[in-house]
């Protein structure tokens, strides 16, 4: 049994660190290997991570963090019984993908405005919660090529957009994702989408 | 009530032996990383060793490295110093001291916040 | 490794009166979680240390409010607002950042 993919971390900067690898052949993850990771730092303990399938040969383990901070580095040692396959070490604050926003929400009852609102993936206390920036990405479900997206580079999580850049009478639907200047993130995931129906009174035409 | 009380000590004759003991009652053991600290006549106090709650992490003063071992035996709530080639400068009250929480991936640290009332080893010929 | 310098060594100090010891590391206790990772711990005649200030500045359980922490980094210190008959003894500081924890030497604090 070997690791034909070495591990590869990304930590969503607050609870939760996920690895992904390969072997060189179809692998029972779960029952088979075990991933070992412990805190660099004094009278830190190891933890075991029981991975789970990720297609025939891949892997995947989510590690549990108490919270992150930069100076953070993990050992990790990934074991098949008393075999052990790969040792490697992981800084979480170098390989963060922060966690997707929540809750969009579509507010179409303000004059011709669309106010899309969504929350902040992080509590307060989390040095990423007044860091992220948004990308929100606005499609027509009945033509692929009416397809959008808008940066938000302010800390409020919403976005002000004219109904009336969208084509009145047919549905749309939104999704937005977040990254971190600041510790040079990959993009989260994106949210859940949503869905409304646009329809705004045309301005009556002069003559 | 938190209650650690250490046994073991005496006199022994340097390059002797000694076993201590700090047996422990009031808190989750387990969760928790023990340390020993001594203080010499007269003097003040020295860290000696440490061992995490599972055991699996261990830490000596270079003054004793290759000399003591700490151990712990989770089942009975006790820590042990194995003390061996004793000298005299090993002379002293030894204390063991509740560390911190090291179940937790980052182990939370709220002082040495019990200690035992401590046992006397003296080395001597 | 770190070494713990405290001052004074004997400080005599009259009953109600303030007192201030000072200690100081010869690198930083300061982890980037935050924490100053210092301690204070008292040592009365003929008994064991007992904690009073963990991480720098937080009283530990039972300490009286006339002792308090403060300091960052490599500079620290203990303040006792009114010094009672009940305050002799030894302080220490001590550092948990890394091992080998280190003490400082100790300051006798004693009643005028």
């Known amino acids: 049994m070997k690791v034909l993919q070495e591990p590869t971390c990304v930590s969503d900067y607050m609870s939760i660190s996920t690895c992904e690898w390969k072997m060189n052949g179809p692998t029972n993850c779960s029952t088979e290997l075990r991933l070992l990771y412990q805190l660099v730092f004094l009278l830190s303990e190891a933890h075991t991570c029981i991975p789970e399938n990720n297609g025939g040969a891949g892997c995947v383990c989510h590690l549990l963090m108490d919270d992150v901070v930069s100076a953070d580095n993990y050992t990790l040692d990934l074991w098949a019984g008393q075999q052990l396959l790969w040792k490697g070490s992981f800084k979480p604050s170098e390989h963060v993908k922060p966690r997707a926003p929540g809750n969009l929400t579509v507010h179409t009852n303000v004059s011709d405005t669309l106010l899309l609102t969504w929350s902040n993936p992080y509590p307060p206390d989390n040095y990423l919660y007044n860091h992220l920036t948004y990308a929100v990405n606005i499609w027509s479900e009945n033509d692929p090529a009416d397809f959008r997206i808008y940066n938000v580079t302010y800390l409020e999580p919403s976005l002000r957009i004219a109904a009336s850049t969208l084509k009145s009478g047919i549905s749309y639907r939104a999704r937005v994702r977040a990254w971190a200047q600041c510790y040079n993130t990959t993009w989260s995931e994106w949210s859940p989408s949503t869905k409304w129906h646009n329809s705004y009174r045309e301005p009556f035409e002069q003559h | 009530e938190v209650q650690l009380v250490e046994s073991g000590g005496g006199l022994v004759q340097p390059g002797g032996s000694l076993r201590l003991s700090c047996a422990v009652s009031?808190?989750?053991?387990?969760?928790?990383?023990m340390s020993w600290v001594r203080q010499a006549p007269g003097k003040g106090l020295e860290w000696v060793s440490s061992?995490?709650?599972?055991?699996?992490?261990?830490y000596y003063a270079d003054s004793v490295k290759g000399r003591f071992t700490i151990s712990r035996d989770n089942s009975k709530n006790t820590v042990y110093l194995q003390m061996n080639s004793l000298r005299a400068e090993d002379t002293a009250v030894y204390y063991c001291?509740?560390?911190?929480?090291?179940?937790?991936?980052?182990?939370?640290?709220?002082?040495?916040?019990?200690w035992g009332q401590g046992t006397t080893v003296t080395v001597s010929s | 490794d770190i070494v713990m310098t405290q001052s004074p060594l004997s400080l005599p100090v009259t009953a109600g009166a303030p007192a201030s010891i000072s200690c100081r590391s010869s690198?930083?206790?300061?982890?980037?979680?935050?924490?100053?990772?210092l301690d204070w711990y008292m040592q009365k005649p003929g008994q064991s240390p007992q904690l009073l200030i963990y991480?720098?500045?937080n009283r530990a359980s039972g300490v009286p409010d006339r002792f308090s922490g403060s300091g960052s980094g490599t500079d620290f210190t203990l303040k006792i607002s009114r010094v009672e008959a009940e305050d002799v003894g030894v302080y220490y500081c001590?550092?948990?950042?890394?091992?080998?924890?280190?003490f400082g030497q100790g300051t006798k604090v004693e009643i005028k």
């Open positions: 690198q930083s206790l300061l982890y980037s979680n935050g924490y100053n990772y």
């Open positions: 061992i995490t709650g599972g055991g699996g992490g261990i």
């Open positions: 991480l720098g500045s």
């Open positions: 001291a509740k560390d911190r929480i090291s179940i937790t991936i980052r182990p939370r640290y709220f002082g040495l916040d019990f």
């Open positions: 009031g808190f989750t053991f387990s969760s928790y990383a």
């Open positions: 001590m550092q948990a950042l890394e091992t080998p924890y280190a």
